[in-house]
C-alpha cells in the first residue's frame, strides 16, 4: 500500500483557512486524528496566557496549513506543499519568539503533531520552495529580499 493521500478537508478547526480544499494526509485515517489534536491545541491556545495577539494572528493559520497541507497539484504522486521558510523563520524568531521558547521546552504541546521546524523547509530561492504555502506575514517580504 502506498503512503500518502490527497483528500478534501472535512474538518471544522481550520475550515476558515482551508475551506474544503484538497489536503495531504500520511494515511487515510489521519485527518480525523489530527483534527482532534488541532481542536485540543486551539482550545488550549484560547485559554493560554503564553500566546500574544501578534503571534496568534499568524501562528494559527500557519499551524492549520502545516497540519493540513494543501496537496501539490503539480506532482504526479500525492505530495504536500510546505510552508514558506521565510515566513516560518519570522514566525519563530520575531512574531512568536517567546511562544516558541515555551513550546520547545514542551515538545508534545501539540500532542501528536510536531512543532514546525523551519530548518526542514526548502531555502526560499530553491525550486522546491516555488510552490510553498504563503500565509501573508507582512514582514516576510522584507525579510525575503534582504537575506
Amino acid at each position: 500500500e502506498e503512503d500518502g493521500f490527497c483528500q478534501p478537508y472535512r474538518g471544522i478547526a481550520c475550515a476558515r483557512f482551508i475551506g474544503n480544499r484538497t489536503v495531504y494526509m500520511e494515511s487515510l485515517h489521519m485527518q480525523g486524528e489530527i483534527e482532534n489534536q488541532i481542536t485540543a491545541a486551539f482550545t488550549m491556545i484560547g485559554t493560554s496566557s503564553h500566546l500574544s495577539d501578534k503571534c496568534s494572528q499568524f501562528a494559527i493559520p500557519s499551524l492549520c496549513h502545516y497540519a493540513f497541507p494543501y496537496c501539490d497539484e503539480t506532482s504526479s504522486v500525492p505530495k504536500p506543499r510546505d510552508l514558506c521558510r521565510d515566513e516560518c523563520e519570522i514566525l519563530e524568531n520575531v512574531l512568536c519568539q517567546t511562544e516558541y521558547i515555551f513550546a520547545r521546552s514542551n515538545p508534545m504541546i501539540l500532542m501528536r503533531l510536531k512543532l514546525p521546524n523551519c530548518e526542514d523547509l526548502p531555502q526560499p530561492e530553491s525550486p522546491e520552495a516555488a510552490n510553498c504555502i504563503r500565509i501573508g506575514i507582512p514582514m516576510a517580504d522584507h525579510h525575503h529580499h534582504h537575506h
Epitope: 500500500e1 502506498e2 503512503d3 500518502g4 495531504y24 500520511e26 489521519m30 489530527i34 502545516y66 497540519a67 504522486v77 500525492p78 505530495k79 504536500p80 510546505d82 515538545p107 508534545m108 500532542m111 501528536r112 503533531l113 510536531k114 521546524n117 530548518e119 526542514d120 523547509l121 526548502p122 531555502q123 522546491e128
Partner: antibody, heavy 120, light 107 residues
Amino acid sequence: EVQLVESGGGLVQPGGSLRLSCAASGFNITGYYIHWVRQAPGKGLEWVGYISPNSGSTYYADSVKGRFTISADTSKNTAYLQMNSLRAEDTAVYYCARDSRRYVRPFDYWGQGTLVTVSS
Amino acid sequence: DIQMTQSPSSLSASVGDRVTITCRASQDVNTAVAWYQQKPGKAPKLLIYSASFLYSGVPSRFSGSRSGTDFTLTISSLQPEDFATYYCQQHYTTPPTFGQGTKVEIK
C-alpha cells in the same frame, strides 16, 4: 508497498571509508526524516543520525560526528550514509528507518540492514 | 540525552505465560515511547507506539502502558513466534534513545 532497502556494506580497513545507500519506495522521502541506526554484533540498537531530505538538514550522534555524513537525493528517493575514518567499533549492521516530519511517531518502517565490518 | 533503562535484560518463559517488560525514562518523555520486536538477523518491527497504541497488524496479545516515566510492554499469552528481543525507544527528543533490550527465551 512501503519499503526501505540498504546497500553498500562490506569489509573495510580501519581508517577507510564506505558509503551506504537507503533506497525508499512506496512513499516520498521529502515528507519524512530518514534515520540511520546501527547494531554491533550481539549488542543493542544505537541511533547514528538523521536527515530531513526536504531541506538537507542533518543531526548526528556524538560518536560519529565529524566522521559520518548523511545526505539524500530526492530525485532518486534515496538517502546515503558516508562513513569516513572508520574504526573497529563502527562494525555493525546499519539500518535505515523513517520517521514522520509532521507527526510524533516512532520508526514505523525499517530496511533489512547492511553489515559493515571494520577490520585489518 | 534521555536514558531508557530496560529490565530485565533477559527472561525465560513458557508458551502461554504472561510476560512483562519495563522501561524507565530518565526524564519526562510524555507518551512518546515505542516498543519493537527483533528476531535474529532481522530488522526491528514496531509493536506499540505512543506508549499504548497497538501498531497495525500486531496481535492484540501485545499491549503497552505508561505510569509517569515508567513504561510497560505486556504479552498476555506468549506464543512460539514471540521468542525474540524487545526494545523500548523514546522519540520525544533528539537523539532518540533505545533501551538495552530484553531477550525472551524458551524455558
